[in-house]
Every structure is written in C-alpha cells, then in structure tokens.
C-alpha cells in the first residue's frame, strides 16, 4: 500500500519579484489524498514564523494538485520577506520551504527585474 502523506511543493530558495501596488497571489501547492488538510501561511520574523490569520486566503483545486493561496490586494512594501505554508496532518505539522517575496516600491519601479531574470528563477514546481 502506498503512503499517503499531505505534501507541500515549494522548492528550496523559491523567490518571486513583484511590484508594490499590484495584486498578487502566493501559491502553496498541496497534495492530499482524502480530507483536505488545514493549511496556513506564516511570515518569517527572526526565529519565528508569525501566522497570517487575518489575511485573505482561498483554495484553487486542480486535477492533480490543489493550491492554498495567500492574496495580496494590493502588494505593500512591507510584504517584502519570506513566507512558509504549513499543514496539519494526523497530528503532524509539516512546513514548506520558505518562499521569498522581493517587493519593488512603485517609486523605484525602474529597478524591477527583467522578464529574463524572473524566468531564470522559477519559484514553484506548479505555476
């Protein structure tokens, strides 16, 4: 019988460059077998990861994978930083690799990374 764990598919050193003022969806790809797990997002602050309990989140279900989405509407400069998603599964907590958002303030939008730069560092397995 195959093992059936909840799985989180964020690669190590995942990163995304975004503009302040734009809407953005941060996706946590989740695989599960039967019951959808309770998934949360947190933001790294020093040695702790602070739960983002008051933020808008949603699920997007696709054929082979689901996405737990953290919504930024809009992105603010202080959204810059590293995030993890985590899931509770059979009393176990599993935490993803961190994914880092690099927020460019609209005032310095000329510093936005080029499409080539962004293409060279895909931040998720599923996008």
């Amino acid at each position: 019988k195959e093992s059936c764990d909840v799985q989180l598919y964020i690669k190590r050193q995942s990163e995304h460059s975004i503009l302040a003022g734009d809407p953005f969806e941060l996706e946590c790809p989740v695989k599960y077998c039967a019951n959808r797990p309770h998934v949360t997002w947190c933001k790294l602050n020093g040695t702790t990861c602070v739960k983002l309990e008051d933020r808008q989140t949603s699920w997007k279900e696709e054929k082979n994978i689901s996405f737990f989405i953290l919504h930024f509407e809009p992105v603010l400069p202080n959204d810059n930083g590293s995030y993890r998603c985590s899931a509770n599964f059979q009393s176990n907590l599993i935490e993803s690799h961190s994914t880092t958002l690099y927020v460019t303030d609209v005032k310095s939008a000329s510093e936005r990374p080029s499409k080539d730069e962004m293409a060279s560092r895909p931040w998720l397995l599923y996008r």
Epitope: K1, E2, S3, D5, V6, Q7, L8, Y9, I10, K11, R12, Q13, K31, L44, T47, N64, S82, I94, E95, S96, H97, S98, L125, Y126
Partner: antibody
Framework: QVQLKESGPGLVAPSQSLSITCTVS????????VNWVRQPPGKGLEWLGM???????DYNSALKSRLSINKDNSKSQVFLKMNSLQTDDTARYYC????????????WGQGTSVTVSS | SIVMTQSPDSLAVSLGERATINCKAS??????VAWYQQKPGQSPKLLIY???NRYTGVPDRFTGSGYGTDFTLTISSLQAEDVAVYFC????????FGGGTKLEIK
C-alpha cells in the same frame, strides 16, 4: 511499506560512465522527490542531486557537468548517470526520498558500492 | 555552497551521560537543518528535522536545537545502541552535510 533499492555495476573503469537505478515501492514518484547521496569509504556524505515530482532536477554545482538524473514514474525507478569517473568517485551511492515538505530525507536505500579501478 | 562545520570529529561518552554535537553553518539557514544517525554498515536514518523536531519513532533522549547558523544535537542519556556516526545537513539551499561525528562509549 516505503522502500528504496539501488542497483549498480559494482566496478567501473576510470574515464567510463556510471549508471545506477533506484527502484522504489510503497510510494509514487509522482508524489515525492528522490535524492542521490554518496559516501566514500570511511568518509562523510555528499549530496549529488535530486529529481522533483515533475521531473525537474537540481544538481550539486561541483558535479553538475558530469551528472544526469532521470526517472520512469510507471516503473517506479530513478536513474543516476555519472560521466568521466575517477578513482575518487569510489563510494557507496544511496537514493533517498524527500520528506513530504522537501526539507529532509526520510527514507534511504541500503546503497550500492561502486569502485572505480582499472 | 553552504558549508556545515561539525564538531567534534569524535566523542567518547559514558553510558547514561550526556552527549552534545555541534554544527555551524557558513551562513544563516533558518531552521532548515536535519540530523542523521548512521550505524556501522547501515544507511543513514533521519533523527531530527526543522532543527528541533523529532522524527517518528526517535527516542525522546534525542533533542535538536538552534536557528540561523548554530545547531546542536543532544543525547541526554547515552545508550549502547546510540554508538554511531551523526551528520547534520542543511536544506536551505542545495543540501550539504557536516563531516560527521563519531560517537563512542567511554
């Protein structure tokens, strides 16, 4: 239960290539990443690379030019190929499964011993 | 790549006593550190992940701690079956292992 088993040639001549197969059971390669790690006799562990669920790969930058990792999901097999072997590639080669979050290796094969010698 | 410097290289501790193994990362790796135990003639086994979480079935005498660059594996009361080589590993970027610590009974 979860199992991984490596099979390799045992002996490889210098400058030749190495091919090792990791056959897994108890889980699907469409659900977990698989790593390759080696250990020279009496020494430490060296991560070689890994293959993700979607078939994309990450490699140890020092060995990238010599390594290739592929898989066949339907056969539950992962393949390591390494070119231009030298005597210091003599080691035990392990495949190991990623944890569900990708942040450690939770199941390891027993390894296959590879000796590079003429 | 991130270098994991493990100390000491070898350690002899009396049965029932505490054993402490250290690992220092060349740059911050958050809590992306795992510890493995390798007994003679066996493959490595996962002991600790997320720097401080005990893996399923691992006795509670094994404790991991640390964050950033400095990490510690502690065995609170050494048992005969704990004789092994212990490795730390970072998974923050491309995985790298410490050089290993050989733990023996004094």
């Amino acid at each position: 239960q979860v199992q991984l088993k490596e099979s390799g040639p045992g002996l490889v001549a210098p400058s030749q290539s190495l091919s090792i197969t990791c056959t897994v059971s108890g889980f699907s390669l469409t659900g977990y990443g698989v790593n390759w790690v080696r250990q020279p006799p009496g020494k430490g562990l060296e991560w070689l690379g890994m293959i993700w669920i979607d078939g994309s790969t990450d490699y140890n930058s020092a060995l990238k030019s010599r390594l290739s990792i592929n898989k066949d999901n339907s056969k539950s097999q992962v393949f390591l190929k390494m070119n231009s072997l030298q005597t210091d590639d003599t080691a035990r080669y392990y495949c190991a499964r990623d944890r569900p979050d990708g942040r450690a290796m939770d199941y390891w094969g027993q390894g296959t011993s590879v000796t590079v010698s003429s | 790549s991130i270098v994991m410097t493990q100390s000491p290289d070898s350690l002899a501790v009396s049965l029932g006593e505490r054993a402490t193994i250290n690992c220092k990362a060349s740059q911050s790796v958050s809590n992306d550190v795992a510890w493995y135990q390798q007994k003679p003639g066996q493959s490595p086994k996962l002991l600790i992940y997320y720097a401080s979480n005990r893996y399923t079935g691992v006795p509670d005498r094994f404790t991991g701690s640390g964050y950033g660059t400095d990490f510690t594996l502690t065995i609170s009361s050494l048992q005969a079956e704990d004789v092994a080589v212990y490795f730390c590993q970072q998974d923050y970027s491309s995985p790298t292992f410490g050089g290993g610590t050989k733990l023996e009974i004094k």
